[in-house]
C-alpha cells in the first residue's frame, strides 16, 4: 500500500549524466531503512508501458546504471524507482524527462602536456563515449558535438595569461621563458548546447636552456 | 482503477484568485505527470500546462505563465491550480489529466464561473 | 505554437456510414526517435471529459471500437469513423504533443443525417 507521503521513502530521482553515461541515483527517505529494496523501470517520451531494468529490480543500492538504456541521443527518457520497506510500505517516484544531449555534462578532456625549452605543446585526446554509430564503434565527444571546441589557456603570471583554441587537437604556446613553471587549464567547449567542461589542469615547467651551458 | 476527482469551481470575482484540486485515486500521483486543461463554454480545449508530482518540475503554457501554479501534495496524492487575476474570459471547466504526452485519463471537470 | 486546424467543424453522416475527420498541424509532428507522429484524437459527449481514442497517431487506445482508426503522417492527419454508430455522435478533437506548449484542434461535431 502507498504511505501517506511517498517522500517517507523515497527523494530526489534523478539522472546524474556524464560524458554521456547515464546513472539514475535516489536517496531513502527519513522511513527508508538498509532493507529498502529499490526496483528500476524506464520508458520513452509517449510511451505507456514501463520496462524493468534487469539488475535492478529488489536492489538495495541507490544507483542504476541506465546508460544502455537510454543511449538514443534523440529520445526523450524517464524512469522511475519503487521502493518497498521491510514492512511492505511502497512509494514510487519519476524522473523528470532526462535527454541525454541536453543533460548530460562533460568531464575534462584528457590531455598531454609536454614541456619544451621555450614552449609548451599540449595534446588532447579524443574523448570516448558509450554510445555506438550504427556500425557499433563508440563515438567520441566530437563525433556528436560538431561545433565541439577546445580553449586552452597559460597562467604565465598572476597578470598574464596566454590563450589559444579551436577544433584541432595539437596546440603548443611559444615564447616562453626557460625553466619556468606554468599552469595549463584546457576546457571543452560546446556552445549550441551551452556546455562546458571542467578544465584539466597541468602544471609544467619549460626546461632548462643548456645552449649556454 | 483510476480516477481523478476535481473540486474547487464555483463563481469568482472578477480579479480574484480559484484553488482547484484533483484528487488521484487508483495509483499513486508521484507516478506520472499531471496536467491541467480547460474549456470555455461551447468553446475547445486549452492545455494550460503539466507537473512532475514526484520533483516538482512544472512546464506552462506561456499564455498561463503569468497566472498559473501548478503544485502537488505528495501525502494526498492531489494536484493544484492555482490561478490569479481571473477575467469573464477564464469561466471555464478546468480539467486535470493525466500522462506526459496524450491525455488517458480525465477527471469530470470543475466549473469555474467569472462574474460580479 | 502548433496551430491545428480540423475540418470540417461538423458532419452529419447516415448510420453505418463512413465519417472522415481531416486535421492539419502548422507544422511537422514527425518524432525523429520512433519515427511516429506526436498526434492523439480525443472523443466528448456533452457534459463528459475528452476520452482518449488514438495516440501516436494511428494506435487505438484500448477499449476503443476498431470502427475508429487514425492515420496520416507529417502534418496531415485524419480520423475515419468506418461505420457511424448512433453512440459516436460527439465533438472530435485531434491534440499535438510534438513541442509545448500542447495544442489542440477547434473541434469537429459529429451528427446523424
Known amino acids: 500500500h502507498a504511505p501517506e507521503d511517498p517522500s517517507d521513502l523515497l527523494q530526489h530521482v534523478k539522472f546524474q549524466s556524464s560524458n554521456f553515461e547515464n546513472i539514475l541515483t535516489w536517496d531513502s527517505g527519513p522511513e527508508g531503512t538498509p532493507d529498502t529494496v529499490y526496483s528500476i523501470e524506464y520508458k520513452t517520451y509517449g510511451e505507456r508501458d514501463w520496462v524493468a531494468k534487469k539488475g535492478c529490480q529488489r536492489i538495495t543500492r541507490k544507483s542504476c546504471n541506465l546508460t544502455v538504456e537510454t543511449g538514443n541521443l534523440t529520445e526523450l527518457y524517464y524512469a522511475r524507482v519503487t521502493a518497498v520497506s521491510a514492512g511492505g510500505r511502497s512509494a514510487t517516484k519519476m524522473t523528470d524527462r532526462f535527454s541525454s544531449l541536453q543533460h548530460t555534462t562533460l568531464k575534462p578532456p584528457d590531455v598531454t602536456c609536454i614541456s619544451k625549452v621555450r614552449s609548451i605543446q599540449m595534446i588532447v585526446h579524443p574523448t570516448p563515449t558509450p554510445i555506438r554509430a550504427g556500425d557499433g564503434h563508440r563515438l567520441t565527444l566530437e563525433d556528436i558535438f560538431h561545433d565541439l571546441f577546445y580553449h586552452l589557456e597559460l597562467q604565465v603570471n598572476r597578470t598574464y595569461q596566454m590563450h589559444l583554441g579551436g577544433k584541432q587537437r595539437e596546440y603548443e604556446f611559444f615564447g616562453l621563458t626557460p625553466d619556468t613553471e606554468f599552469l595549463g587549464t584546457i576546457m571543452i567547449c560546446v556552445p549550441t548546447w551551452a556546455k562546458e567542461s571542467a578544465p584539466y589542469m597541468c602544471r609544467v615547467k619549460t626546461l632548462p636552456d643548456r645552449t649556454w651551458t | 482503477e483510476v480516477q481523478l476527482v476535481e473540486s474547487g469551481g464555483g463563481l469568482v470575482q472578477p480579479g480574484g484568485s480559484l484553488r482547484l484540486s484533483c484528487a488521484a485515486s487508483g495509483y499513486s500521483l508521484t507516478a506520472d505527470y499531471m496536467n491541467w486543461v480547460r474549456q470555455a463554454p461551447g468553446k475547445g480545449l486549452e492545455w494550460i500546462g503539466e507537473i512532475n508530482p514526484s520533483t516538482g518540475t512544472t512546464t506552462y503554457n506561456q499564455k498561463f505563465e503569468a497566472r498559473a501554479t501548478l503544485t502537488v501534495d505528495q501525502s494526498k496524492n492531489t494536484a493544484y491550480l492555482q490561478m490569479n487575476s481571473l477575467r469573464a474570459e477564464d469561466t471555464a471547466v478546468y480539467y486535470c489529466?493525466?500522462?506526459?504526452?496524450?491525455?488517458?485519463?480525465w477527471g469530470q471537470g470543475t466549473l469555474v464561473t467569472v462574474s460580479s | 505554437d502548433i496551430v491545428m486546424t480540423q475540418s470540417p467543424d461538423s458532419l452529419a453522416v447516415s448510420l453505418g456510414e463512413r465519417a472522415t475527420i481531416n486535421c492539419k498541424s502548422s507544422q511537422s509532428l514527425l518524432y525523429s526517435s520512433n519515427q511516429k507522429n506526436c498526434l492523439a484524437w480525443y472523443q466528448q459527449k456533452p457534459g463528459q471529459p475528452p476520452k482518449l481514442l488514438i495516440y501516436w497517431a494511428s494506435s487505438r487506445e484500448s477499449g476503443v471500437p476498431d470502427r475508429f482508426s487514425g492515420s496520416g503522417s507529417g502534418t496531415d492527419f485524419t480520423l475515419t469513423i468506418s461505420s457511424l454508430q448512433a453512440e459516436d455522435v460527439a465533438v472530435y478533437y485531434c491534440?499535438?504533443?510534438?513541442?509545448?506548449?500542447?495544442?489542440f484542434g477547434q473541434g469537429t461535431k459529429v451528427e446523424i443525417k
Open positions: 489529466a493525466r500522462f506526459d504526452a496524450y491525455f488517458d485519463y
Open positions: 491534440q499535438q504533443y510534438f513541442s509545448y506548449p500542447f495544442t
